[in-house]
Structures are given as C-alpha cells and as structure tokens.
Interface confidence: low
C-alpha cells in the first residue's frame, strides 16, 4: 500500500492521543535504553510503511503484536485516514472486544515495540521547531 495520500496530521493526532500511551503501557517495566533503534524511516509515507510492517507482519520470535491494543488502534487510524487502506473501516470498540489477553511478552516483541516507538517518533517529527 502507498501511504502517500494519508491524512498525516489526523494520524499524528491519533498517535499522540492514544497509540503512544498504549505503546508505553506495553513497554512498562522496560528500560528505555535496553534496545537500540535499528529501524528508521526517512519521510512520513516511509514511516507508515515500516510501522505497518512491524505492527502487523509476524516475525521470528514475535508473532502476536497484531492483537495488541496499540495495533488495533493503529489499524483503525490507517483504515480511516488512508484512502483505500481497508475495505471495511475497523471500529475501535469492536477491535477491543476481539482482543485476546496477552499471556507472554517475549523479549523479541519488546524489542520490536521499542522499534515501533522510534518509528512513530520519526513520523511525528516537526517541520520546524516550536518557539
């Protein structure tokens, strides 16, 4: 999917208001210096491409992120603010009901979510510093 035509400001607002807090909750108890950021992105469409990949594509050692609250909200934001991203716009409340309780958080998953936090920070990078 080409994220060029997304409403970046609306996605940014969704991240700041809720997704960021869910990521922090997931990472609670983990030192911020524990993982090095090895994934980066160079513009907003590129960031969303990397965020989608890390959030929804299963990887070795971490297959379960798509069921997490931050993932559900990410999917909802992309469905709503990226034209054609999803045929059916996901309702966040329905997504919450479907969510399975996470039993085990592997170190690999923590590392992956740490990378996601970095990607989201890059996505929200200011054009110009606020005075």
């Amino acid at each position: 999917y080409d994220f060029t035509n997304c409403d970046f400001e609306k996605i940014k607002a969704a991240y700041l208001s809720t997704i960021s807090k869910d990521l922090i909750t997931y990472m609670s108890g983990t030192k911020s210096t524990e993982f090095n950021n090895t994934v980066s992105c160079s513009n907003r469409p590129h960031c969303l491409t990397e965020i989608q990949s890390l959030t929804f594509n299963p990887t070795a050692g971490c297959a379960s992120l798509a069921k997490e609250m931050f993932a559900m909200k990410t999917k909802a934001a992309l469905a709503i603010w990226c034209p054609g991203y999803s045929e059916t716009q996901i309702n966040a409340t329905q997504a919450m009901k479907k969510r399975r309780k996470r039993k085990v958080t592997t170190n690999k998953c923590l590392e992956q979510v740490s990378q996601l936090q970095g990607l989201w920070r890059r996505f929200n990078r200011p054009l110009l510093k606020q005075q």
């Epitope: 513009n43 054009l127 110009l128 510093k129």
Partner: antibody
Framework: QMQLVESGGGVVQPGRSLRLSCAAS????????MHWVRQAPGKGLEWVAV????????HYADSVKGRFTITRDNSKNTLNLQMNSLRAEDTAVYYC???????????????WGQGTMVTVSS | SYVLTQPPSVSVAPGETATITCGGN??????VHWYQQKPGQAPVLVIY???DRPDRIPERFSGSNSGNTATLTISRVEAGDEADYYC???????????FGGGTKLTVL
C-alpha cells in the same frame, strides 16, 4: 554498504554544458531527498539543489537557478545534475548528498559521496 | 536569504574545550546541523537537530541552540579534531539549505 558515487566531472569551457551523475547503493534511494553541494577550491560549502524523494519538487540556489537542473531515476537509483551555461565561478568539487526527507522539509546530510571536480576554464 | 555567521578560526590546546558558534536571526527556531571536514575529504555529519549525535561520533561532541546562536562544543579536544566545521539549516521560507561560512579549528 551505503554508498554514493559521483561521475561526469571534468574541464569545460565557459558557456558549455556538463552532466553529473550519482549512483546510489546500499539503501532505499527512493525514500530519501537528494542534494548537490559544491565547494570551490579553498572555499566553504555551498548548497546547489535538492530533489524530493519522489521527484515531486526541486529547489535551487539562486546562483544556479535557471542554469542547472536536478533529476532522479528511482528505478535506477541515480541522481543527475544537468549544468548549462557554465561560468568560471561554477568551478568546484560537486558532492552528491543524501538527506532523510521529511514531509516538505529537508534534514541533515547523513551520507556524502567523495565528490567530482568540475573546472570551468577557457 | 537566511545568513549563518561563523568565526573564521578557533584555536584550542589539546585536552581543552573548543566552542564554535553559528549566528543567525532567531536561529533557535531552526534545527541546526554541524559537519566536520578534514582536508581532501568529504564532510561528515557530527551533530544533527541541534544536539543529537550520529552513531560513531564521540560523546565529546555536543550541540546547543537558542536565541540567535547555535553552538558546537568539543570537549577534551584531540589532534584528530583539527578540521573545518560548518553549521547548516534548512530555510523553510525560501526552500534553501544554508551553510555557515565554516570555522577552522586548530589544535595547538
């Protein structure tokens, strides 16, 4: 390994044209803004031009506007600088430079080529 | 267009702290980047976004930016730090990248 390699420099007479190329490898070229920066012998750095990651916009230093054209081919991972109506003051080392390119802004230059020398002389 | 002003030269003894300034009108509102260039070599990014350090750049290099002046600080200066240093900003008003004139750091 990430690399930028410039080519096309040389000696050219005033008023003539020259085309510089830059081959990129080892990174996702199509996601980066690309710039040309030049440095006259014994002088400081001078920004020349930028092209957005998707080629949708270009901007030029006042000193080259209307004479130089920056283009890119994302399918071939190449950046070009077409230089027309060359002047003696265009004599410099020309660097091809990568910059993470943000939603309508440009960032720090995190990867530089080694440069190619352009000499404009009669 | 936007102008960045740097001192032409700064001298410092080994082990001391070097401070290189970059002046610009309300530069504190811009994100400032710094480059090191040694003779015959391409420039290298040493500080980006005012104060962030790329990988492989020693912690001795730091940056700050407020008001009308951005500053590059090199603590415990070594002979290998001798080089030209350039500050840089992106001018959003003109869509131009702007470099300072450069500062030659001499290690005595």
């Amino acid at each position: 390994q990430m690399q930028l390699v410039e080519s096309g420099g040389g000696v050219v007479q005033p008023g003539r044209s020259l085309r510089l190329s830059c081959a990129a490898s080892g990174f996702a070229f199509r996601t980066y803004g690309m710039h040309w920066v030049r440095q006259a012998p014994g002088k400081g750095l001078e920004w020349v031009a930028v092209i957005w990651y998707d080629g949708s916009a270009t901007h030029y230093a006042d000193s080259v506007k209307g004479r130089f054209t920056i283009t890119r081919d994302n399918s071939k991972n190449t950046l070009n600088l077409q230089m027309n109506s060359l002047r003696a003051e265009d004599t410099a080392v020309y660097y091809c430079v990568r910059a993470p390119q943000w939603y309508l802004s440009a960032e720090a230059f995190d990867l530089w080529g080694q440069g190619t020398m352009v000499t404009v002389s009669s | 267009s936007y102008v960045l002003t740097q001192p032409p030269s700064v001298s410092v003894a080994p082990g001391e702290t070097a401070t290189i300034t970059c002046g610009g009108n309300l530069i504190g509102a811009y994100l400032v980047h710094w480059y090191q260039q040694k003779p015959g070599q391409a420039p290298v990014l040493v500080i980006y976004d005012d104060s962030d350090r790329p990988d492989r750049i020693p912690e001795r290099f730091s940056g700050s930016n407020s008001g009308n002046t951005a500053t590059l600080t090199i603590s415990r200066v070594e002979a290998g730090d001798e080089a030209d240093y350039y500050c840089q900003v992106w001018d959003h008003n003109t869509n131009h990248m702007v470099f300072g004139g450069g500062t030659k750091l001499t290690v005595l």
